[in-house]
Interface confidence: low
């Protein structure tokens, strides 16, 4: 808390300009009118204030707007946004996409902070729906935002929002989300050639059906084990040994290390042991020669 002190003679700020960087904290508190600050917020960002000075400016705005800042101030917060707490942001009513973009720009290149998460939550709730423009803005800044949406919300995502998604942005997506995202990615990338297509679609394959995996096995894609382990079990089970061998290419040897984990474990249980032996990896647990292939539901119960 900054003490209330009178402004020294001749130091009263008539406008927000660079001369203020030489003011001590108490002088800023005493000599800068909060209403003046609010109307000239756009200038603050261009002035190299110290963190301590920014704290004083924030304090002045908090006093002027105890119920929450108006959008005219919010849009021009710039780096002062980084000083806001989630509690501050919950008081705001942000309706303009331009305001959202301006604040996301401040945090660009960094992970989504609690402040940004709160801001997005307030914005989306304020709008009442996640429209295309909002979603496109959010995925442009935070492609990982997709994984925070429910499958129902994801169903309204246009294929065009998929282009910027990086592999790490899908790390937190669960299979139900990938089920929704995969067809959109397939649509967005379908005109790419084989190797480029695989690079782009790889992160989304946790939502791929069996027929698509079979098609990929014909394209020498050399899927790595990490990707294979994220595939839907029900999509992997119908694949033949030959198809998995083609799908993984040189990575097929990694199956041995994963033979006790899903989906490899469940897949092994569905294959004839003779076929597994052709891989030369020592995989055990396949169907002995001469036995019928068990019904899938019964197989699941046994495993």
């Amino acid at each position: 808390e900054v003490e209330k002190t009178a402004c020294p003679s001749g130091k009263k700020a008539r406008e927000i300009d660079e001369s203020l960087i030489f003011y001590k904290k108490w002088e800023l508190e005493a000599c800068v009118d909060a209403a003046l600050l609010a109307t000239q917020m756009d200038r603050v960002n261009a002035i190299p204030f110290t963190y301590e000075q920014l704290d004083v400016l924030k304090h002045k705005l908090d006093e002027l707007y105890p119920q929450g800042y108006p959008e005219s101030v919010i849009q021009h917060l710039g780096y002062l946004f980084l000083k806001m707490s989630p509690e501050d942001i919950r008081k705001w009513n942000v309706t303009s996409l331009e305001t959202l973009k301006a604040l996301l720009e401040v945090n660009k290149g960094h992970e989504m902070s609690p402040q940004v998460a709160t801001l997005i939550d307030r914005f989306v709730k304020g709008r009442g729906q996640l429209d295309k423009d909002t979603l496109d803005t959010l995925t442009a800044f935070y492609p990982g935002y997709l994984c925070s949406l429910s499958p129902e919300e994801l169903s309204s995502v246009p294929p065009s929002s998929i282009w910027a998604v990086r592999p790490q942005d899908l790390d937190t997506c669960d299979p139900r989300q990938l089920d929704v995202l995969y067809p959109k990615a397939r649509l967005a990338f379908q005109n790419m050639n084989g190797s480029e297509y695989f690079v782009k679609i790889q992160s989304f394959l946790g939502g791929a059906p069996t027929e698509d995996l079979k098609a990929l096995s014909q394209q020498n894609v050399s899927m790595d084990l990490a990707t294979f382990m994220k595939l839907r079990t029900d999509a992997v089970l119908p694949l033949t040994v030959a198809e998995v061998q083609k799908l993984l290419g040189p990575h097929v040897e990694g199956l041995k290390a994963e033979e006790r984990h899903r989906p490899v474990r469940d897949w092994i249980l569905r294959q004839r042991q003779d076929d597994l032996d052709t891989l030369g990896l020592g995989l055990q647990g396949g169907i002995p020669n001469g036995y019928l292939v068990l019904d899938l539901s019964m197989q699941e119960a046994l495993s």
Partner: antibody, heavy 121, light 108 residues
Framework: QVQLVQSGAEVKKPGESLKISCKGS????????IGWVRQMPGKGLEWMGI????????QYSPSFQGQVTISADKSISTAYLQWSSLKASDTAMYYC??????????????WGQGTLVTVSS | DIVLTQSPATLSLSPGERATLSCRAS???????LAWYQQKPGQAPRLLIY???KRATGVPARFSGSGSGTDFTLTISSLEPEDFATYYC?????????FGQGTKVEIK
């Protein structure tokens, strides 16, 4: 062969509306993004915006947002660029072009021949 | 927006000479998402190079692209008469995609 054919040159007065077209052939029109690029007389290339013909989802450059409208009719493999009220500064050559791979993830691999729009009173 | 600055603005060379065109980005263009186009007077641009170094279909081997990050180069190993034109670089990594201002290669 793969080509984009644009509508002919237009001469208009300020304040008039205009819609120019770009028809794709020789490939699956709905599988590729179509972009529009402006080239003012004697100047360089400026990216205006893009459309995904399947659902007509558009994305504009901030410089052109609200100034033009991009649309498409997938049934006739045609994309459009339109103005509701032309200005003299809209005088330029306008090119449509196809994105080779994905949205911004690709270069413009096929170009239309261009449509010259002249706005003069 | 990423600003692309091409240099030189004009390059005066004779047929058979080597042309080196530069394109510098104001910030890193990741994943080599940079293309080069050739435009002759009265014609539409034509894609030469994409992915910073991959030649587009039908582009002669004398055209090559290189570079990464913020510095990219288009090289024409031996100029043919039909190569005299204006060349533009374009980044398609960041939104919105942007073009350089162009380099005109003219006959000396």
């Amino acid at each position: 062969q793969v080509q984009l054919v644009q509508s002919g040159a237009e001469v208009k007065k300020p304040g008039e509306s205009l819609k120019i077209s770009c028809k794709g052939s020789g490939y699956s029109f709905t599988n590729y993004w179509i972009g529009w690029v402006r080239q003012m007389p004697g100047k360089g290339l400026e990216w205006m915006g893009i459309i995904w013909p399947i659902d007509s989802f558009t994305q504009y450059s901030p410089s052109f947002q609200g100034q033009v409208t991009i649309s498409a009719d997938k049934s006739i493999s045609t994309a459009y660029l339109q103005w509701s009220s032309l200005k003299a500064s809209d005088t330029a050559m306008y090119y449509c072009a196809r994105y080779g791979h994905g949205m911004y993830g690709g270069a413009l691999d096929v170009w239309g021949q261009g449509t010259l729009v002249t706005v003069s009173s | 927006d990423i600003v692309l600055t091409q240099s030189p603005a004009t390059l005066s060379l004779s047929p058979g000479e080597r042309a080196t065109l530069s394109c510098r980005a104001s910030q890193s263009v990741r994943s080599s998402r940079l293309a080069w186009y050739q435009q002759k007077p009265g014609q539409a641009p034509r894609l030469l190079i994409y992915g910073a170094s991959k030649r587009a279909t039908g582009v002669p081997a004398r055209f090559s692209g290189s570079g990464s990050g913020t510095d990219f180069t288009l090289t024409i190993s031996s100029l043919e008469p039909e190569d005299f034109a204006t060349y533009y670089c374009q980044q398609y990594y960041d939104f919105p995609p942007t073009f350089g201002q162009g380099t005109k290669v003219e006959i000396k």
